[in-house]
C-alpha cells in the first residue's frame, strides 16, 4: 500500500529583503512524488526552484525537498504543492519565527 508524506515548510533569511522557503516531504511510499512551489496557485518555473533527490530514509519510505527564494512580505502568495499516489495538498509558508508546520496528508 501507499504511505502518505509528512510535509513540512520552513523559512530562513537569505539576503536583504529575501527569504528561502523549503518544503520537505518525508516518510512516503512509493517514491513517486510531485513537489513544487507555486505563486498565486501557478507552479514556479523550473529554473527558480532547487530540488533534492528522492532518497530512502531508512524505514522503507522516502524523503525529498524543494526550495525557492522569495521576497519578504510576499509569503502569502506562495504555497508548496504536493501530489502523491493520487492525493494532493497545499502548504503555506509559516509566518516569521514560527515553529515548523507539519502536515500528514491522508
Amino acid at each position: 500500500g501507499s504511505v502518505p508524506p509528512m510535509v513540512n515548510v520552513t523559512r530562513s533569511e537569505a539576503s536583504e529583503g529575501n527569504i528561502t522557503v523549503t518544503c520537505r516531504a518525508s516518510s512516503f511510499y512509493p517514491r513517486n512524488i510531485t513537489l513544487t512551489w507555486r505563486q498565486d496557485g501557478v507552479s514556479l518555473s523550473h529554473d527558480t526552484q532547487q530540488w533534492g533527490d528522492v532518497l530512502p530514509d531508512g524505514n522503507g519510505t522516502y524523503q525529498t525537498w524543494v526550495a525557492t527564494r522569495i521576497c519578504q512580505g510576499e509569503e502569502q502568495r506562495f504555497t508548496c504543492y504536493m501530489e502523491h499516489s493520487g492525493n494532493h495538498s497545499t502548504h503555506p509558508v509559516p509566518s516569521g519565527n514560527s515553529h515548523h508546520h507539519h502536515h500528514h496528508h491522508h
Partner: antibody
Amino acid sequence: VQLQESGPGLVKPSQSLSLTCNVTGYSITGDYAWNWIRQFPGNKLEWIGYIGYTGSTTYNPSLKSRVSITRDTSKNQFFLQLNSVTPEDTATYYCARWRNWAMDYWGLGTSVTVSS
Amino acid sequence: DIQMTQTPSSLSASLGDRVTISCRANQDISHYLNWYQQKPDGAVKLLIYYTSRIHSGVPSRFSGSGSGTDYSLTIANLEQEDVATYFCQQGNTPPTTFGGGTKVEIK
C-alpha cells in the same frame, strides 16, 4: 467550474475596453490564478495577465502599461480593463483558471472589435 | 519572450489514423508544456499538461511527450470529434506563450 465572459462587442479607438468574467463552481479566493487571454484574427493567442486568489496581479510586460485586472469577491467575478485601445486590440477575449501548470478551465470567449 | 513553433500548421488525416503534432521552443522549457484543443465554435479545453499528464476526462487516445525544447502531441486513433485546432503553451518562463496552432481536418 464554469467561466463566462461578457462585455461590449464594439469599442472606439482610444477608449477603454472593459470585460467581466463570471465564475461559478469555484471561489476565486480559494486558490489558483484567474487569467485573461486573447486570440487575434488568424488564431494567435496572447496571455494578458492574471489576478491570483490573494488578489495579487501579474501582467504580460508587453501590455502592463495599459492593463488592469481587478475582482469582486462578493460576486465571484474578475475584470479586465485595457486602456487606449487601437484596432490591433480587436480579438476574442477569454478568461481562464490557471491551476498549477496549466489553464484547466476556459470561458467560451467574447469577441471585441475596436473601430470608430 | 520564449517563441513556440508548432508544425504542421494544418493537416488532413483519415479516421483511425495516428496523428502527431510538434512544438519547439527556442530554449529549454523543462517539461512545462501544455496542449489545448480549440473546437470550431471557439471552445478551448486542456488536453495534456506538464508534457505528458492527461487532464481529467480527456480520452486516452491523446498523449504527450518530449523534453528540453522539443515536444509532441499524439492522437492514436483519429475520431471525427477531434476536428479542431491544437495549441501548445509553455509555462516555464514568464510571460507564458503559445504556439501558432495546428488545424486538424478529416480527409
